[in-house]
Structures are given as structure tokens and as C-alpha cells.
């Protein structure tokens, strides 16, 4: 039975060119975490493992910074960045759990930060 | 001893889709440890980079934007072995056909390619 | 992309000397993160696959002879052949795989003096 619920950072916007951190927090279960893989529309992001540690994708070496903790933080942000995000939580003894992100990367340099909210 | 051996055809038609197989002994498609790749080499382009597939919890593939349209790869666990498909084929994709195992040495998300399957010439005509 | 660049595109070497390969890539491919460089060295013989040689820069693949060793840092690489061996005639390559799209270097055609 998967009892753990996901807290996410929710709908974010940030600047063109400025940096931004998506969160995500696994809550009310007492599963072992053995990875997260962060994605962006299907396409690998980067991995934190239990044993192995961060691991970056190819694709996003120069851009994307592991943490704080199991996050991950974005830098140099391009319109092209908006879009949703995905954390995947793999527990053992529960299975997966998956909370999602959206973000918007605004050109003005008005951006707000979108409220919590949870993924059950 | 990692073993990989392609199968496909060698001349396909102008517009037509090319289907390559590799099948893999002595590693898993599935490995946690491995991607799984597909390069070509021509003497215009030299060794191209096409993509690869790999397991990760889940699966991923990521391809080069230069295919990314028309390419398709696939794993397949119950043969132990993986495909590429390459759409709308042209005469400028004459080349040989390399299917690569990826290892994932230190960083579990890139490596260098330490198996190389035999290499097939596919010849794009009509 | 990344581009790799090696030079020169040919190099003939009389049997027992050294025979040294050079590769730039067109950006760093030393991650900081990890502190690793992100490139390979490949031999390929004519109607064979390419062979690894060498990877994160310097380190030598099992079964690889210790003639063989990779250098460098950042953008500038270099393989080195310490004495050559009839049998190391062949084209060599670098890549990186720092970054997608994964890219080769032209190739540097070895052969004997």
C-alpha cells in the first residue's frame, strides 16, 4: 500500500536567463528512496542515486546544478525551458511516486512563485 | 565477453526506412550500468553519433538533432536486444551501421564505447 | 556540438618511435562537478569497428598495451604511441562525450615510415 504523498515547488515562473529551483519532498511513508530522476517531458535531466550519487544527462551538463538535497536547480534559463517537470521517486517498499513541476520562463522581469500544492 | 551482432538489410530505397538489430550477449539491454548506441560513419561525415537507448528505472532514449525526426530506437528485453529505425532514407545516409554498448564507468548517464558490434554498410539507391 | 579537431590528419613514424596525436575540442569537456574529462581515444584497422583505447582522458582500457596513453586537460588532448608497433598502423579518433550530440574527432591515419 503507498501511503507517501509528493510536495512539490507547484507553478513557478522565473526570468529569462536567471535561475530557478525545482523541489520536491516525499512524505507520510517510511519507504527507502533508492533514486530520483528528474525529467523534462520524457527526456532524462539528471539522477540522484542512493549509492552512486548526482549524475548529470549529456544534454544538460552546463546547465543544470545538483541540490539542494534531492532537488535540482536550473540555471541559465531560456524560454525553451518552460514546460513540466517531473520528479520520480523510486522506493523501496512502496514503487514509484511522481510529483510534477510547471514552469513558465518569463521575458519581463515579473515572476512570481506559484503556490504548493501535492500530488497523492 | 560483451558480443554484439547486427542483422539488417544493406541496400534500402530513397524514401524508404531502414531496420537494424542488435542482438546482445553477455550484457542485458536492461543493465543499469550501459546505454546503447548507434553510430555511423561515412567518409563525408566521418563517425556520426545517431542515439541511443538505455534503463534507467525506466527507459530513455535521447537522439541527435541532426536525425531526430526520422529515428526510432527501441529495446527489446524478451530478445535481449535493441533496434534502430531511420525513416526517409536518402542517398547521404549511405554508410556504415554501428551499433556501440555505452558504458557507464563512474557516471551512470555517459561513457565511452567499449563494444562495437560488426558494422553494417547500408547502401541508400534505387 | 561539441567539435573535435585532431591534427595532423596523417603522421608516419619509423617502428619503435614515439608517435604522438593531438585533439582540441571547440569547448571544455572537464566537468567540475565530478572532475572527470569526458573524452576517448579510438584505434580502427580497416574493415574492423573501432576500439576503445583510452577514456576519461587517461585512463588505458583493459588489455590495452601500456604504449598507449592519453593526456591532456580541458580542450587539448593528446594520445601517445611510445614506440610504434607494426601493428598499431590504423586511423585514430577522439571523442567526446561530455555533451550531446556525442562527437568524433576527423581521424589521424598512422602509419610506418
Known amino acids: 500500500m503507498m501511503t507517501g504523498t509528493i510536495e512539490t515547488t507547484g507553478n513557478i515562473s522565473a526570468e529569462k536567463g536567471g535561475s530557478i529551483i525545482l523541489q520536491c519532498h516525499l512524505s507520510s511513508t517510511t519507504a527507502q528512496v533508492t533514486q530520483v530522476n528528474w525529467e523534462q517531458q520524457d527526456q532524462l535531466l539528471a539522477i540522484c542515486n542512493a549509492d552512486l550519487g548526482w549524475h548529470i544527462s549529456p544534454s544538460f551538463k552546463d546547465r543544470v546544478a545538483p541540490g539542494p538535497g534531492l532537488g535540482l536547480t536550473l540555471q541559465s534559463l531560456t524560454v525553451n525551458d518552460t514546460g513540466e517537470y517531473f520528479c520520480i521517486y523510486h522506493t523501496y517498499p512502496d514503487g514509484t511516486y511522481t510529483g510534477r513541476i510547471f514552469l513558465e520562463v518569463l521575458e519581463s522581469s515579473v515572476a512570481e512563485h506559484g503556490a504548493r500544492f501535492q500530488i497523492p | 565477453q560483451v558480443q554484439l551482432q547486427q542483422s539488417g538489410p544493406g541496400l534500402v530505397k530513397p524514401s524508404q526506412t531502414l531496420s537494424l538489430t542488435c542482438a546482445i550477449s553477455g550484457d542485458s539491454v536492461s543493465s543499469n550500468s550501459a546505454a546503447w548506441n548507434w553510430i555511423r560513419q561515412s567518409p563525408s561525415r566521418g563517425l556520426e553519433w545517431l542515439g541511443r537507448?538505455?534503463?534507467?528505472?525506466?527507459?530513455?532514449?535521447d537522439y541527435a538533432v541532426s536525425v531526430k525526426s526520422r529515428i526510432t530506437i527501441n529495446p527489446d528485453t524478451s530478445k535481449n536486444q535493441f533496434s534502430l529505425q531511420l525513416n526517409s532514407m536518402t542517398p547521404e545516409d549511405t554508410a556504415v551501421y554501428y551499433c556501440?554498448?555505452?558504458?557507464?564507468?563512474?557516471?551512470?548517464?555517459?561513457?565511452?564505447?567499449?563494444?562495437w558490434g560488426q558494422g553494417t554498410l547500408v547502401t541508400v539507391s534505387s | 556540438d561539441i567539435v573535435m579537431t585532431q591534427s595532423p590528419d596523417s603522421l608516419a613514424v619509423s617502428l619503435g618511435e614515439r608517435a604522438t596525436i593531438n585533439c582540441k575540442s571547440s569547448q571544455s569537456v572537464l566537468f567540475g562537478f565530478n572532475n572527470k574529462i569526458y573524452l576517448a581515444w579510438y584505434q580502427q584497422k580497416p574493415g574492423q569497428p573501432p576500439e576503445l583505447l583510452i577514456y576519461?582522458?587517461?585512463t588505458r582500457e583493459s588489455g590495452v598495451p601500456d604504449r598507449f596513453s592519453g593526456s591532456g586537460s580541458g580542450t587539448d588532448f593528446t594520445l601517445t604511441i611510445s614506440s610504434l608497433q607494426a601493428e598499431d598502423v590504423a586511423v585514430y579518433y577522439c571523442q567526446q562525450y561530455y555533451s550531446f550530440p556525442y562527437t568524433f574527432g576527423q581521424g589521424t591515419k598512422l602509419e610506418i615510415k
Open positions: 537507448t538505455y534503463f534507467r528505472s525506466k527507459w530513455y532514449n
Open positions: 576519461w582522458a587517461s
Open positions: 556501440a554498448r555505452e558504458r557507464a564507468l563512474y557516471d551512470i548517464l555517459a561513457g565511452s564505447f567499449d563494444y
